[in-house]
Interface confidence: medium
């Protein structure tokens, strides 16, 4: 009875094995000769020499002995500090990359099945990427006083600085601070400039936007792709291989379709206030028959910092009074088509591919840094008109303040959010046969290999 039980158990075992493998009966075991022109199964490759479908080696292994007509591939484990990531038939495992440098963080350890991945630590960006991780990290540029962050650093691109436009300032050396609007004073003691806020006299000032420095998030490197770094005005040292692009037109261009509406708003407002003032003066004259003095303080209109960079604000157009200290760097790029349309998706700018005329592919945030109100450009114009009776030369002033906020440009077509720049994808171009066993992993890349390398599979599996 015992032999019957053994045979029954064996039969059941074989059935279970067959069910688990579910292979065609004719070609259940490797190596086997396929029909000419047909494909081998998953995790098999076609050996041109043996003319057989043979087993691939699993990740973490390599082919120690290649298959023949009568014997299958013999696999062996990868040695220390070597790996194979995919099913393969490489004769030797690939060496893991060198240890991460001091400016890098090891985000993936070297194992038998995966390469070590090094990414840049916070405050650094990847200046030279490799297939996975980063080859060379560089510190993020710091914008000196008078310059703010135009584009924050990412894991693969440096910070881009820009001179603070009229009406904004930055008094820090920082890789995160943007230009902030000057505070609005009832009476200005010291006018603000690009590197200093306005100083008010006695009465409490107001700000056109939320006070305090606006900090941009520091990038945390995860997976790097190469982005062509672009030099910007900065006090921070820049890595030696970044060459300046040569002079460009002043910051953000000097013309634009924003000029007309801003001019109209400011003009009409000023005109209206002037008329009101004149009417007041006439009334006062009629009533008191005293001379009038018409004082007007027109404050520079303010935009929220970096608001809707998809369209150019009035500061960027230099339409209004330019603060004495504000400057335009010759390195700053003019607004080109790419300026407004480059996405912020960490899409790499391929080596050798430059943004037309600009020397950079500027990423636009698509929406406001500080205002939840969408893509429109808000112009905050505050006019204070003091109408004084001056018979005794004492200051009896009736103040009339007018504040105008206009949403001038909220057309969705200007939103750069979803527009793609057709940068060429070069990250695969750097894959060498030595770096990627995947060329032997069922791919049929049409490049001859060194003589010792086995053949490609019949078709990718």
């Amino acid at each position: 009875m015992a032999p019957v039980a053994v045979w029954a158990a064996l039969a059941v075992g074989l059935e279970l094995w067959a069910a688990a493998h579910a292979l065609p009966a004719q070609v259940a075991f490797t190596p086997y000769a396929p029909e000419p022109g047909s494909t081998c199964r998953l995790r098999e490759y076609y050996d041109q020499t043996a003319q057989m479908c043979c087993s691939k080696c699993s990740p973490g292994q390599h082919a120690k002995v290649f298959c023949t007509k009568t014997s299958d591939t013999v696999c062996d484990s990868c040695e220390d500090s070597t790996y194979t990531q995919l099913w393969n038939w490489v004769p030797e495992c690939l060496s893991c990359g060198s240890r991460c440098s001091s400016d890098q963080v090891e985000t993936q350890a070297c194992t038998r099945e995966q390469n070590r991945i090094c990414t840049c630590r916070p405050g650094w960006y990847c200046a030279l990427s490799k297939q996975e991780g980063c080859r060379l990290c560089a510190p993020l540029r710091k914008c000196r006083p008078g310059f703010g962050v135009a584009r924050p650093g990412t894991e693969t691109s440096d910070v881009v600085c820009k001179p603070c436009a009229p009406g904004t300032f930055s008094n820090t050396t920082s890789s995160t601070d943007i230009c902030r609007p000057h505070q609005i004073c009832n009476v200005v003691a010291i006018p603000g400039n690009a590197s200093m806020d306005a100083v008010c006299t006695s009465t409490s000032p107001t700000r056109s936007m939320a006070p305090g420095a606006v900090h941009l998030p520091q990038p945390v490197s995860t997976r790097s792709q190469h982005t062509q770094p672009t030099p910007e005005p900065s006090t921070a040292p820049s890595t030696s291989f970044l060459l300046p692009m040569g002079p460009s037109p002043p910051a953000e261009g000097s013309t634009g379709d924003f000029a007309l509406p801003v001019g109209l708003i400011v003009g009409v407002t000023a005109l209206g206030l002037l008329i009101i003032g004149v009417v007041n003066c006439v009334i006062m004259t009629q009533v008191k028959k005293k001379p009038l003095c018409l004082q007007r303080e027109a404050k520079v209109p303010h935009l929220p910092a970096d608001k809707a960079r998809g369209t150019q604000g009035p500061e960027q157009q230099h339409l209004l009074i330019t603060a004495p200290s504000s400057s335009s760097s010759s390195l700053e790029s003019s607004a080109s088509a790419l300026d407004r349309r480059a996405p912020t998706r960490n899409q790499p700018q391929a080596p050798g591919v430059e943004a037309s005329g600009a020397g950079e592919a500027r990423a636009s945030t698509g929406s406001s840094d500080s205002s939840p109100g969408g893509h429109g450009t808000q112009v905050n114009v505050t006019c204070i008109v003091n109408v004084c009776s001056s018979s005794d030369h004492s200051s009896q002033c009736s103040s009339q303040a007018s504040s105008t906020m206009g949403d001038t440009d909220s057309s969705p077509s200007e939103s750069p959010k979803d527009e793609q720049v057709p940068f060429s994808k070069e990250e695969c171009a750097f894959r060498s046969q030595l770096e990627t066993p995947e060329t032997l992993l069922g791919s049929t890349e049409e490049k001859p290999l060194p003589l010792g390398v086995p053949d490609a599979g019949m078709k990718p599996s």
């Epitope: 022109g37 041109q48 003319q51 049929t444 001859p448």
Partner: antibody, heavy 116, light 107 residues
Amino acid sequence: QIQLVQSGAEVKKPGASVKVSCKASGYTFTTYGMSWVRQAPGQGLEWMGWIHTYSGVPTYADDFKGRVTFTLDTSTSTAYMELRSLRSDDTAVYYCARGLYGVDYWGQGTLVTVSS
Amino acid sequence: EIVMTQSPATLSLSPGERATLSCKASENVVTYVSWYQQKPGQAPRLLIYGASNRYTGVPDRFTGSGSATDFTLTISSLQPEDFAVYYCGQSYTYPYTFGQGTKLEIK
């Protein structure tokens, strides 16, 4: 569809060399070995050797060693066979053929005539 | 080298008849034998591979059999288009070799 297209007929003098091309299309060139077979007029098939299309490693039959060279241009999916020091008995139709184990596709053949 | 010997050299049969072509290898070639059909002015055409596997598109009247050193190609009922020269070839060891061919002609 799969095709192997060979270069045209050649007439050569004894001692000269001939280079026959075979352009493959309709499949991944580097997947299958490329064999070279010749057939003298009224005679049988004679295997000259083959080339491993992925690595470029050739294997030559003993009768042709030293006189024949197989090469590849994978960018154009073309295999080449060069035969040197031609003799009158090298007059034959030369075929390129895909694979080794059951050669499933053949070129149309290139007639090489060696005559003084 | 392995010598492949085909017999008969010529076989004269009528359409509808059964044809049996023989191929003997001088050494064991396991089942690494293929059969080819060649018509005048044309390249050879693969019929059978691995001694007994019919290639795609080949009519089922063609059957291959045998192993080691003795191999047979059988055409069960000859059609007019079957009259041609048939070659066997081994791809077991270098140099790969072909038989001298069997000419199948109409009687």
